[in-house]
């Protein structure tokens, strides 16, 4: 029995619903009484949802899963996962048994966009060319871990003297703090780009330091 799932991971935003697609080709005369469908976590084999003896056996996964009962007879064994969490990320196996059996695994990739970075400066007054300053770029509640890039006003990448830390909160979402230490020129714009590698989403923050005063666009 051939069971088909998408090759590419299913990307779902935290808090939204995701559909894990799975299909099979029913033979002529197929009835739901013959169908046994099991969704499980691939690695741990934990049961997620099942259908047997013509009946939806329900969710075994925090009551956040559902099948598409009206579509099962046409060979649609897809699973709806509600209110996606970071902890849901991973591989799900769709197992279908009729007269023969087959299975396939689909990957769920969870994502959350990063907030617009906030920029802070230390020290933040009486700055003169030649002073060393610490610029901190902070972006919150994203997933997965971000890629952080710094550049100056001319678009030249700044890679030295950058320290980036990422901490996961209780939901598994990351707060990113990236610190750039620079020696001030006469005028300077410093930009921080926080990229979500899954969503290909860029969040920008910048600070412009002019003799005095300073501006934070």
């Amino acid at each position: 029995l051939e069971v088909q799932v998408p090759e590419d991971p299913v990307v779902a935003l935290v808090g939204t619903d995701a559909t894990l697609c799975c299909s099979f080709s029913p033979e002529p005369g197929f009835s739901l009484a013959q169908l046994n469908l099991i969704w499980q976590l691939t690695d741990t084999k934990q049961l997620v949802h099942s259908f047997a003896e013509g009946q939806d056996q329900g969710s075994a996964y925090a009551n956040r899963t559902a099948l598409f009962p009206d579509l099962l007879a046409q060979g649609n064994a897809s699973l709806r996962l509600q209110r996606v969490r970071v902890a849901d990320e991973g591989s799900f196996t769709c197992f279908v048994s009729i007269r023969d059996f087959g299975s396939a695994a689909v990957s769920l990739q969870v994502a959350a966009p990063y907030s617009k970075p906030s920029m802070t400066l230390e020290p933040n007054k009486d700055l003169r060319p030649g002073d060393t300053v610490t610029i901190t770029c902070s972006s919150y509640r994203g997933y997965p871990e971000a890629e952080v890039f710094w550049q100056d006003g001319q678009g030249v990448p700044l890679t030295g003297n950058v320290t980036t830390s990422q901490m996961a909160n209780e939901q598994g979402l990351f707060d990113v703090h990236s610190v750039l230490r620079v020696v001030l020129g006469a005028n300077g714009t410093y930009s921080c780009l926080v990229r979500n590698p899954v969503l290909q989403q860029d969040a920008h923050g910048s600070v412009t330091i002019t003799g005095q005063p300073m501006t934070f666009p």
Epitope: L1, Q34, N36, I38, Q40, K45, A52, E53, T93, F95, S97, R99, D100, F101, G102, S103
Partner: antibody, heavy 119, light 109 residues
Framework: QVQLQQSGAEVKKPGSSVKVSCKDS????????ISWVRQAPGQGLEWMGG????????NYAQKFQGRVTITADESTSTAYMELSSLRSEDTAVYYC????????????WGKGTLVTVSS | EIVLTQSPATLSLSPGERATLSCRAS??????LGWYQQKPGQAPRLLIY???NRASGIPARFSGSGSGIDFTLTISSLEPEDFAVYYC???????????FGQGTKLEIK
């Protein structure tokens, strides 16, 4: 030619346990359903239980429930059948069998493992 | 639990003759019925699956038929190597559980 290679003959005391192994030389245990069938001397075939390794779910004939444990190690393509609280009537040849990928039919069989229970 | 009853217990025939082996289920088993051949000192060999489908490498003289509770294995013209014990087997839908009949011994007359 794919073969199921079973472990060697065992002699066991009543009350003890035996664990028989069955290695799939094709190395593709995951996509198969594995069954264990026994045959006492001069008797017929008796299905004991089976496992679908990809699910990790085993099920057993009512007669053996609570006394038999069937497991599978996908990394080594080996299935195991452990029978506990042995008695003399458990003396039999124990076979493992499987179908082709996705098939429940028992079209490939091991050569059998003789387990003798004697005090 | 479904019980399979095979008849006759022993069948004595000569090479070249037609053999008809019967298997009756205590309740309907749908199409999940197979037949196995076993020779002394050997593991069983699948002959027929899903009532009437010949397994790989099985000669055309073996055929299966039936539905519901009554099933038949027919060997159209017996060859010397066909004398053996034959078992019918049923599989439940889910979970997959199996039952064998008690066997029919086909012996040379």
């Amino acid at each position: 030619q794919v073969q199921l290679q079973q472990s060697g003959a065992e002699v066991k005391k009543p009350g003890s346990s035996v664990k028989v192994s069955c290695k799939d030389s094709g190395g593709t245990l995951s996509s198969h359903a594995i069954s264990w069938v026994r045959q006492a001397p001069g008797q017929g075939l008796e299905w004991m239980g089976g496992i679908i390794p990809i699910l990790g779910i085993a099920n057993y004939a009512q007669k053996f429930q609570g006394r038999v444990t069937i497991t599978a190690d996908e990394s080594t393509s080996t299935a195991y059948m452990e029978l506990s609280s042995l008695r003399s009537e458990d003396t039999a040849v124990y076979y493992c069998a499987r179908g082709g990928p996705g098939s429940y039919h028992m079209d490939v069989w091991g050569k059998g493992t003789l387990v003798t229970v004697s005090s | 639990e479904i019980v399979l009853t095979q008849s006759p217990a022993t069948l004595s025939l000569s090479p070249g003759e037609r053999a008809t082996l019967s298997c009756r289920a205590s309740q309907s088993v749908g199409s999940s019925l197979g037949w196995y051949q076993q020779k002394p000192g050997q593991a069983p060999r699948l002959l027929i699956y899903d009532v009437s489908n010949r397994a790989s490498g099985i000669p055309a003289r073996f055929s299966g038929s039936g539905s519901g509770i009554d099933f038949t294995l027919t060997i159209s013209s017996l060859e010397p190597e066909d004398f053996a014990v034959y078992y019918c087997q049923q599989r439940s839908n889910w979970p997959p559980m199996y039952t064998f009949g008690q066997g029919t011994k086909l012996e040379i007359k």
